[in-house]
């Protein structure tokens, strides 16, 4: 049974374009993701020149940091990109939007780069083991959320080709020592643990040896017990839109969720002249919902083609997981075709055919 037409309106449906200045939008990204922050003007009007600030310091645009008046993009995010971000009016320094961004380690699945560090004949006649990729072994402490996959690697070489073994907290580590087992990829000099749990915390040591010597490296694993949360929706999405009659419109909704999210697009409607039921629940129709052939990516966009005046109104992106639901709403204003596009642009984005 899909969400019916009996649903209650959010406390403040107007606070769509992102958090109030006093509120922090909490966002979580994975390492390597693109951090996208959106801060549309309050009320849809012009907001003048803005500046993006991280932890109190103005952000300098670069190839990785793309700064726009209403949008900030940080490409290939890393731990260092975590922090408090705000968008401020340049002249008054008034905070328009406030975000708390956390970039978590998203370790590789254990299957990428396979074969890259396979044992190779170095051409050296004889020799003790040595690390072939020491720069890849810098990260001695790995903190990952529970349920992630972890891979420790110790790419090495020597002649004869050394053997690799693993210790946990100084003791021999074998598959039967953990639920779910382990994958030892000798060719890749790696140890893979899938779906880590708190009991996997500890010191992991690779021991690489041949008859000429032995080298070792110790990694510390910390498993973070994830605090479950309802889906997090990116601030400012969907954004209010102004469109010309007959044009096409797209609403976007970016959903972050640990558990598999269920996304729906709803349009608020009137029943007998009322937008809400007797108990304050809004009347909505479901425009788009998860189906057998729809991907999450497709559900993050609602496309309206050849819009009519009847398409004007309030649209909601509703996302749920096993913890709960989150929703953001936006308004579509449809203008007559003969209206000047420039005027319409004052109120938001215009999509002309």
């Amino acid at each position: 049974e899909s969400l019916g037409t009996e649903q209650r309106v959010v406390g403040r449906a107007a606070e769509v374009p992102g958090p109030e200045p006093g509120q922090q939008e909490q966002l979580v990204f994975g390492s390597g993701d693109a951090v996208e922050l959106s801060c549309p003007p309050p009320g849809g009007g012009p907001m003048g020149p803005t500046v993006w600030v991280k932890d109190g310091t103005g952000l300098v645009p670069s190839e990785r940091v793309l700064v726009g008046p209403q949008r900030l993009q940080v490409l290939n995010a890393s731990h260092e990109d975590s922090g408090a971000y705000s968008c401020r009016q340049r002249l008054t320094q008034r905070v328009l939007c406030h975000f708390s961004v956390r970039v978590t380690d998203a370790p590789s699945s254990g299957d990428d780069e396979d074969g890259e560090d396979e044992a190779e004949d170095t051409g050296v006649d004889t020799g003790a083991p040595y690390w072939t990729r020491p720069e890849r072994m810098d990260k001695k402490l790995l903190a990952v959320p529970a349920a992630n996959t972890v891979r420790f690697r110790c790419p090495a070489a020597g002649n004869p080709t050394p053997s690799i073994s693993w210790l946990k907290n100084g003791r021999e580590f074998r598959g039967e020592h953990r639920i779910g087992g382990i994958k030892l990829r000798h060719q890749q000099w790696s140890l893979v643990m899938e779906s880590v749990v708190p009991s996997d915390r500890g010191n992991y040591t690779c021991v690489v040896e041949n008859k000429f010597g032995s080298i070792r490296q110790t990694y510390t694993l910390d498993v973070l017990e994830r605090s479950p949360h309802r889906p997090i929706l990116q601030a400012g999405l969907p954004a209010n839109q102004t469109a010309v009659l007959g044009s096409d419109v797209e609403f976007h909704c970016k959903v972050y969720s640990d558990a598999q999210p269920h996304i729906q697009w709803l349009k608020h409607v009137e029943v007998n002249g009322s937008k809400v039921g007797p108990d304050g629940t809004p009347y909505v129709t479901v425009l788009k919902t998860a189906g057998a052939n729809t991907t999450d990516k497709e559900l993050e966009v609602l496309s309206l083609h050849n819009v009519t005046f009847e398409d004007a109104g309030e649209y909601t992106c509703l996302a749920g997981n096993s913890i709960g639901f989150s929703h953001h709403s936006a308004w579509l204003v449809v203008l007559p075709a003969e209206e000047e596009l420039v005027e319409a642009d004052e109120a938001g984005s215009v999509y002309a055919g």
């Epitope: 019916g4 509120q23 509703l318 709960g324 929703h327």
Partner: antibody
Framework: QVQLVQSGAEVKKPGSSVKVSCKAS????????ISWVRQAPGQGLEWMGG????????NYAQKFQGRVTITADESTSTAYMELSSLRSEDTAVYYC????????????WGQGTLVTVSS | DIVLTQSPATLSLSPGERATLSCRAS???????LAWYQQKPGQAPRLLIY???SRATGVPARFSGSGSGTDFTLTISSLEPEDFATYYC?????????FGQGTKVEIK
């Protein structure tokens, strides 16, 4: 109008289990979370856990983890809460409540089920 | 978990007086996720305020909510006889959902 009707009072022995039902009518059952909240005599309200029928997965407060099981039957619009290994401190009124995801509140409540644990 | 501390534990007032109930959170709570409930003996709780300041359907105008961050307030402008009850604040900002321990408003 949404209504939540719970099963009747129960008297249980320590160590046994109790299963309380909560039948919903007048709304869209599967798309809303149903939470269970208990109240010991003269005490405050305590959230135990909840379930959203369309997701099937229940979530539990740490305190009750391993002792409570929350399930839902979409065909009968009924949610269930089973508490095992009962002890005298579990004597309380158990409420089911609908979670409104538009207002982030418990907007409708069952009438409550008194569970008395006594030897 | 977010701990909600309500004060005072008991408020003794006469009908017609103004009641001010406080709810303090151990960490910041988005106001959209803060609610107040009223409970009378032998009855289930009843939703009064959602989103920190919006009155639920059928709730009299004498009830109002305010606050943000960690400090929230429920105000009853002029107590009616039927308002003497226990009031709970509750947050859904962070999992798990938590309630305050309650404030009992009794007749002086």
């Amino acid at each position: 109008q949404v209504q939540l009707v719970q099963s009747g009072a129960e008297v249980k022995k320590p160590g046994s289990s109790v299963k309380v039902s909560c039948k919903a009518s007048g709304g869209t059952f599967s798309s809303y979370a149903i939470s269970w909240v208990r109240q010991a005599p003269g005490q405050g309200l305590e959230w135990m856990g909840g379930i959203i029928p369309i997701f099937g997965t229940a979530n539990y407060a740490q305190k009750f983890q391993g002792r409570v099981t929350i399930t839902a039957d979409e065909s009968t619009s009924t949610a269930y809460m089973e508490l095992s290994s009962l002890r005298s401190e579990d004597t309380a009124v158990y409420y089911c409540a609908r979670v409104n995801h538009w207002t982030y509140t418990f907007d409708y409540w069952g009438q409550g089920t008194l569970v008395t644990v006594s030897s | 978990d977010i701990v909600l501390t309500q004060s005072p534990a008991t408020l003794s007032l006469s009908p017609g007086e103004r009641a001010t109930l406080s709810c303090r959170a151990s960490q910041s709570v988005s106001s959209s996720y803060l609610a107040w409930y009223q409970q009378k003996p032998g009855q289930a709780p009843r939703l009064l305020i959602y989103g920190a300041s919006s009155r639920a359907t059928g709730v009299p105008a004498r009830f109002s909510g305010s606050g943000s961050g960690t400090d929230f307030t429920l105000t009853i402008s002029s107590l009616e006889p039927e308002d003497f009850a226990t009031y709970y604040c509750q947050q859904m900002s962070n999992y798990p959902d938590t309630f305050g321990q309650g404030t009992k408003v009794e007749i002086k």
